[in-house]
């Protein structure tokens, strides 16, 4: 037989807290235990579940756990079944609710001297005890002409007067705990002698020169006084109007009319109602002058076909806030479709080429209307008008490569040379139409060129090979003036290139033949031993079959190269004495001497009184100072060559002679004494 060792028992429970209904069985066979609630099987949930044979509650729920629980044990083999005693929960709970008006039926019916009943909608088990509050202060039974039943949830005020006005709240407690009203009730019972607002003035916005009307009404017994004031507290009456409110009229019903409104009329207007008793009631309303600012400019927009784009129209600042709408081709855009307005935005869904054009954003209010156009371009992928073609360009001449395309907007064209972007410089120029001009074609310009034409919609590209057609030219051009050293061997080179290897020949400009000691060997003029007669004008002629011939004229000078007869020496001079740096050079043509001191050329015309360069080339510095110290370079030059030699100059303090030294003892260095 199945025996219950522990049976569930009825118990107190708290809403939302844990609980356990125990059940333990003993039986010879294998039994399984389940629970019934009001006769129906209990399904396990996270909140309520079987734990062994017992039923565990993670959080008791007053609604779902009310009823009779029973533990059932069943032997599935024999079919024997045993049921426990019934058990139930006494669930304690409390739940907040609002304070509501029970009597009269609506707030509008509350009049002085009528009975008012408020109900506290806090519920619980066991039944709570209630406490009422006005403006946060507890109310006790019989206090100030009210009847309070703490057992009841009702508060009755009989009769209700202005002194009962306030914010009513309630709290309640029971064995579970305490709760206060979730929503309170404001009771307002006016004193009829107090001014009460019937109609309050509203802020108004008017356009300049239009009229503005403020309505204001109070009620009281006896009827209240009504007065209008403008910003500076100046009263406005039909008899005494302030100077800036000449066009103001106060009507018998309290309304204030302002005609032909000006900017100075804008401001705060106060309507004051004063009853026989009570404080004045001040109502304010502002008169705004309508205004609308200019709209910001739109940048032109470029969109690609098929995309979705939005253009936001920033409404201009204005009072009242301007309304905004978009138009295209004079027609207001709808609020849905493929091209439509959404809020302040112009929306173009799946853009088509036909959507291109001018769209206008309009903004308007009482002050007027503003508009701003936006130009929308629908970009297309460029198409070819003329692709770059493989070209043969002549060296030294301008060359052109074309890249003509068309698209919307006008495509931008960039050129690449050997995959490197061509930046415009003195040699490369890209015209507006995309044509590349190479200003002075050089041999190494023979390579691949690629142009890319782009719009926001896409790009196209093409490449072309440039072959440079070499001109017949000297490489390098011979120097037009050259010097040869007398009685020495000399060579004058001349080389040229062309489409075909040129033949090179030297001749004397006077047409006379070259002497036997002068040979012309593959373009190099060779002088075995230069004589005076070798000086003169020579012509190098380069020629080939297809390109003809070119000439270069060279004037050869025979010279005796420069040598120094006298070179300046390392010199030390006492401060205040005179320094002499000697330099003499010889050569033919006769060389000129120049001096360089402290890294600057000494200009004989600007030397000043202390320095002088003699005819023979020597440099004299009088009254030397320490700053004259340094390296001095003698430069000898003629039309044929230039040579230089240098020496340091040291300026030292004159030592004080010691007793042991005789007057004739020499200084330890080469010294010029003057």
């Amino acid at each position: 037989a199945i025996v219950f060792i522990k049976q569930p028992s009825s118990q107190d429970a708290l809403q939302g807290r844990r609980a356990l209904l125990r059940c333990e069985v003993e039986a010879p066979g294998l039994v399984h235990v389940y629970w019934l609630l009001d006769g129906a099987p209990v399904q396990d949930t996270e909140r309520r579940f079987t734990q062994g044979s017992s039923l565990s509650f993670a959080a008791v729920d007053r609604l779902q756990d009310s009823g009779t629980f029973q533990c059932v044990a069943r032997d599935d083999v024999t079919g024997e079944e045993a049921r426990s005693a019934n058990a139930s929960f006494n669930i304690k709970w409390i739940e907040a609710g609002p304070v509501v008006l029970k009597h009269p039926a609506s707030e509008a019916e509350i009049q002085p001297q009528t009975q008012v009943t408020l109900r506290c909608h806090i519920d619980g088990h066991p039944r709570p005890t209630y406490q009422w509050f006005r403006d946060g202060t507890p109310l006790s039974d019989g206090q100030s002409n009210n009847t309070v039943s703490s057992k009841e949830r009702n508060l009755t005020l009989r009769p209700a007067g202005p002194e009962h006005s306030g914010l009513y709240s309630c709290c309640a407690h029971n064995a579970f705990g305490q709760a206060c009203s979730s929503q309170n009730f404001t009771l307002s019972i006016a004193d009829e002698s107090f001014a009460r607002v019937v109609l309050a003035p509203q802020d108004v916005i008017v356009a300049r020169n239009e009229e503005a009307m403020f309505h204001c009404q109070f009620s009281a017994q006896p009827p209240p006084n009504l007065q209008w004031l403008f910003e500076d507290e100046t009263p406005i009456t039909n008899r005494s109007r302030p100077p800036h409110l000449r066009r103001a009229t106060v009507f018998a019903n309290g309304s204030l009319l302002l005609t032909q409104v000006r900017p100075r009329n804008a401001g705060v207007y106060r309507c004051i109602g004063q009853g026989q008793r009570g404080p004045p009631v001040i109502l304010e309303a502002t008169l705004h002058l309508a205004e609308i600012e200019d709209m910001p400019l739109f940048e032109p927009r470029v969109f690609t076909a098929g995309s979705e784009e939005r253009v936001t129209c920033l409404p201009p600042k204005g009072l009242p806030e301007p309304s905004v709408w978009w138009e295209h081709a004079g027609v207001r855009l709808p609020t849905h479709g493929r091209v439509y307005q959404k809020g302040h935005e112009l929306v173009l869904a799946s853009i088509a080429e036909s959507d291109a054009g001018v769209y206008t954003c309009h903004a308007a209010n009482l002050a007027g209307q503003r508009r701003q156009d936006v130009n929308i371009t629908v970009a297309t992928v460029p198409t070819w008008l003329k692709k770059p073609q493989d070209s043969q360009l002549e060296e030294g001449k301008p060359g052109y490569l074309h890249c003509l395309t068309q698209a919307t907007p006008k495509p931008t064209v960039v050129w690449y040379r050997n995959q490197m972007l061509i930046s415009e410089d003195s040699r490369f120029e890209v015209f507006k139409n995309g044509t590349l001009r190479i200003n002075n074609v050089e041999v190494y310009d023979g390579t691949w060129y690629r142009c890319v034409s782009s719009t926001p919609a896409g790009s196209i590209e093409a490449q072309a090979r440039v072959q440079v057609l070499e001109k017949l030219k000297f490489t390098p051009p011979p120097q037009p003036q050259q010097c040869m050293e007398f009685d020495k061997e000399a060579t004058v080179p001349c080389s040229a290139t062309g489409r075909e290897k040129p033949t090179i020949k030297w001749e004397r400009a006077d047409g006379s033949s070259l002497p036997e000691w002068v040979t012309d060997n593959a373009g190099t003029l060779h002088f075995a031993r230069v004589t005076r007669d070798d000086a003169g004008n020579y012509t190098c002629i380069a020629s080939n079959g297809p390109q003809g011939q070119i000439r270069a004229h060279v004037q050869l000078t025979v010279a005796v190269f420069i040598t120094f007869k006298v070179e300046p020496e390392r010199t030390t001079v006492y401060q205040g004495h005179t320094a002499l740096l000697q330099c003499e050079a010889q050569g033919d043509p006769k060389p000129l001497i120049q001096w360089k001191g402290k890294d600057r050329i000494l200009d004989p015309t600007k030397l000043g009184p202390r320095m002088h360069i003699f005819q023979n080339g020597s440099l004299v510095i009088h009254d030397v100072a320490p700053e004259d110290s340094g390296r001095y370079t003698c430069i000898a030059g003629n039309s044929c060559n230039i040579k230089h030699t240098e020496a340091p100059l040291y300026v030292v303090d004159k030592p004080v002679p010691e007793e042991s030294e005789g007057p004739g003892s020499p200084p330890p260095y080469k010294m010029i004494q003057t």
Epitope: Q392, L469, L472, E500, I541, G545, P546, Q547, G548, Q549
Partner: antibody
Framework: QVQLVQSGAEVKKPGASVKVSCRAS????????IHWVRQAPGQGLEWMGW????????NYAQKFQGRVTMTRDTSITTAYMELSSLTSDDTAVYYC??????????????WGQGTLVTVSS | DIQMTQSPSSLSASVGDRVTITCRAS??????LNWYQQRPGKPPKLLIF???SLQSGVPSRFTGSGSGTDFTLSISSLQPEDFATYYC?????????FGQGTKVEIK
């Protein structure tokens, strides 16, 4: 004006040689190459070679190599073309032409009036 | 050597006609092509040099165009004195070579 004047017509026996002259005037003779071009009766133009009056350098067409000699005399601004071992196939009008140029390329202008050489036994 | 091929070899046309002669090179010769006119019993006369430059004294009805391997000589309105043989010649490389000629005859 620039002019090239050639020597008169010649009749030669097969195996003989012919020397045609071309006198230049109106420009600096040594500045331009002289080319020789021949035209057989009813045929097209055939290039024979050139001479540089300045250097005396020559360049002959492969076909005439060893049979043609081009010379010049700068003192009388005259160029010569001599063709040896004549055969009847050499019957043609022989033209000299100045080679004008611009450093990139060139063209024949002007041409001599032509010299008819007839080779007949 | 560069081969020059002219077409047609001959053509018949009337005074006032537009005539076009083409010349093709066996390899690219850039723009280095010249055109000559030869009347019977006369030496050739230069018409066009470097493909499109008109020699001074030549009427403007003669125009040349082309580059690379394909070139054309056009006579916009044929005149009686234009009936002759026309030759193209390349001066791109040595040896200079001529086309076989195009004879323009009176129709």
């Amino acid at each position: 004006q620039v002019q090239l004047v050639q020597s008169g017509a010649e009749v030669k026996k097969p195996g003989a040689s012919v020397k045609v002259s071309c006198r230049a005037s109106g420009y600096t003779f040594t500045d331009y190459f002289i080319h020789w071009v021949r035209q057989a009766p009813g045929q097209g133009l055939e290039w024979m070679g050139w001479i540089s009056p300045n250097s005396g350098g020559t360049n002959y067409a492969q076909k005439f190599q060893g049979r043609v000699t081009m010379t010049r005399d700068t003192s009388i601004t005259t160029a010569y073309m001599e063709l040896s071992s004549l055969t009847s196939d050499d019957t043609a009008v022989y033209y000299c032409a100045r080679y004008d140029y611009d450093g990139y390329s060139g063209w024949f202008d002007p041409w001599g009036q032509g010299t008819l050489v007839t080779v007949s036994s | 050597d560069i081969q020059m091929t002219q077409s047609p070899s001959s053509l018949s046309a009337s005074v006032g006609d537009r005539v076009t002669i083409t010349c093709r090179a066996s390899q690219s010769i850039a723009i280095y092509l010249n055109w000559y006119q030869q009347r019977p019993g006369k030496p050739p006369k230069l018409l066009i040099f470097t493909a499109s430059s008109l020699q001074s004294g030549v009427p403007s009805r003669f125009t040349g165009s082309g580059s690379g391997t394909d070139f054309t000589l056009s006579i916009s309105s044929l005149q009686p004195e234009d009936f002759a043989t026309y030759y193209c010649q390349q001066s791109y490389s040595t040896p200079p070579t001529f086309g076989q000629g195009t004879k323009v005859e009176i129709k």
